[in-house]
C-alpha cells in the first residue's frame, strides 16, 4: 500500500462546527516522500473552487505526515462553507475531498429573542 504518490487525507464529508470570533485552524494532512509539494486552499462556490490567495497559511511537520494549515483568526460568519486543498506534484494536480465549516454566529444567536419573549409579543 505504501506509495510515493502525494496523498491528501481530508475525509470525505468531514464537518467542523465552529464559533464566529474564535480562532480556528483547518488542517490538510499531506503525505509525501521526498519533495514537499506546493499546496493551496480554495473555497467552494457552487461547482468552482475559488483559490484563497491572501489568507494566512503554515506548515506543521510530524513524523509520518505534514499538515498544511489554513488559519482563521478569528472565524467570521461568512467563513461558513466548504473548503478543499490541492497539491501540485510532478505536474499533476491532486485534489482533496471537501470539508465543511458550520459557523455559528454567537452574537446573532445570543441577540435572537427567546421562545418565551416571542410568545409574549
Amino acid at each position: 500500500k505504501e506509495s510515493c504518490d502525494v496523498q491528501l487525507y481530508i475525509k470525505r464529508q468531514s464537518e467542523h462546527s465552529i464559533l464566529a470570533g474564535d480562532p480556528f485552524e483547518l488542517e490538510c494532512p499531506v503525505k509525501y516522500c521526498a519533495n514537499r509539494p506546493h499546496v493551496t486552499w480554495c473555497k467552494l462556490n457552487g461547482t468552482t473552487c475559488v483559490k484563497l490567495e491572501d489568507r494566512q497559511t503554515s506548515w506543521k511537520e510530524e513524523k509520518n505526515i505534514s499538515f498544511f494549515i489554513l488559519h482563521f483568526e478569528p472565524v467570521l460568519p461568512n467563513d461558513n462553507g466548504s473548503y478543499r486543498c490541492s497539491a501540485n506534484f510532478q505536474s499533476n494536480l491532486i485534489e482533496s475531498h471537501s470539508t465543511t465549516l458550520y459557523v455559528t454566529d454567537v452574537k446573532s444567536a445570543s441577540e435572537r429573542p427567546s421562545k418565551d419573549e416571542m410568545a409574549s409579543r
Epitope: K1, S3, D5, V6, Q7, L8, Y9, I10, K11, R12, Q13, S14, E15, H16, S17, P29, K31, I65, I94, E95, S96, H97, S98
Partner: antibody, heavy 121, light 112 residues
C-alpha cells in the same frame, strides 16, 4: 498491520445499557472514520453510524438515533458504541470498521471480528 | 434511505464456472464529486465482512483478479470469472454516496 480488537461477547439484561469497544492498532484513528454495523442472526448488515475521531463529529442512521451513541478516545485509539434501553431486537453481532481516506488510491477498509450481544433475562 | 436490491438471493455454482450478482439502487449513486461510492463485500461463514471492491470497480489489495465490478448510476454487477472454493459466502453491495449508508440484502454463493 492494522487490527481492530473487539470483545467477543456480552450478555445484558433487557432495559439495561451496554458500551462496546473497538481498539485499533497499527493506525491512528484520528486519520479515519470509525463506524459501526449491526448484523442480526441470519440477517443482513445495517449501518448504525460513524464518528470522526479527530473532532468527535458523529452521524447516525435515523433508525438508530436515540438508541446508539458513538464516541472515541484518541489517547487509547478506541471507538465505543453505547446502546441504551436494550430489547431482544438488539441481540446481534456488532462490527466496528475503519475507513481510511486518501486522495488517489482511496478508502482502505478494515473490519473488526464483531461482538456478539445477547439481550436476555 | 437508498434501497439496494440484490439478485439472485442464492447462487449455486460449480467450481471453475463463472458467477454474476446484480445490485440495483433506488437512486443514482453518482456523487457530486464525480465518484460512485459502490462497494462489494464478502462475508465468509463465521467471519466478519471483508471488502473486495470499492468505487464500483477498484479491487482491494490481495483480491484476486477473477473478481470484477462494473456498472454506473443505479445498476451494478459483480462477476467472478471462475469460482473457487474459497469464494463461498454471502456477497453484499453497499453504497456510501448517500446518507445513511445502506447495504443490499446479500447473495449467498454456494458450491454445487
Amino acid at each position: 498491520e492494522v487490527q481492530l480488537q473487539q470483545s467477543v461477547a456480552e450478555l445484558v439484561r433487557p432495559g439495561a445499557s451496554v458500551k462496546l469497544s473497538c481498539t485499533a492498532s497499527g493506525f491512528n484513528i484520528k486519520n479515519t472514520y470509525m463506524y459501526w454495523v449491526k448484523q442480526r442472526p441470519e440477517q443482513g448488515l445495517e449501518w448504525i453510524g460513524r464518528i470522526d475521531p479527530a473532532n468527535g463529529n458523529t452521524k447516525y442512521a435515523p433508525k438508530f438515533q436515540g438508541k446508539a451513541t458513538i464516541t472515541a478516545d484518541t489517547s487509547s485509539n478506541t471507538a465505543y458504541l453505547q446502546l441504551s434501553s436494550l430489547t431482544s431486537e438488539d441481540t446481534a453481532i456488532y462490527y466496528c470498521a475503519l475507513l481510511y481516506y486518501g486522495s488517489s488510491y482511496d478508502y482502505f477498509d478494515y473490519w473488526g471480528q464483531g461482538t456478539t450481544l445477547t439481550v436476555s433475562s | 434511505d437508498v434501497v439496494m436490491t440484490q439478485t439472485p438471493l442464492t447462487l449455486s455454482v460449480t467450481i471453475g464456472q463463472p458467477a454474476s450478482i446484480s445490485c440495483k439502487s433506488s437512486q443514482s449513486l453518482l456523487d457530486s464529486d464525480g465518484k460512485t461510492y459502490l462497494n462489494w463485500l464478502l462475508q465468509r461463514p463465521g467471519q466478519s465482512p471483508k471488502r473486495l471492491i470499492y468505487l464500483v470497480s477498484k479491487l482491494d489489495s490481495g483480491v484476486p483478479d477473477r473478481f470484477t465490478g462494473s456498472g454506473s448510476g443505479t445498476d451494478f454487477t459483480l462477476k467472478i470469472s471462475r469460482v473457487e472454493a474459497e469464494d463461498l459466502g454471502v456477497y453484499y453491495c453497499w453504497q456510501g454516496t448517500h446518507f445513511p449508508q445502506t447495504f443490499g440484502g446479500g447473495t449467498k454463493l454456494e458450491i454445487k
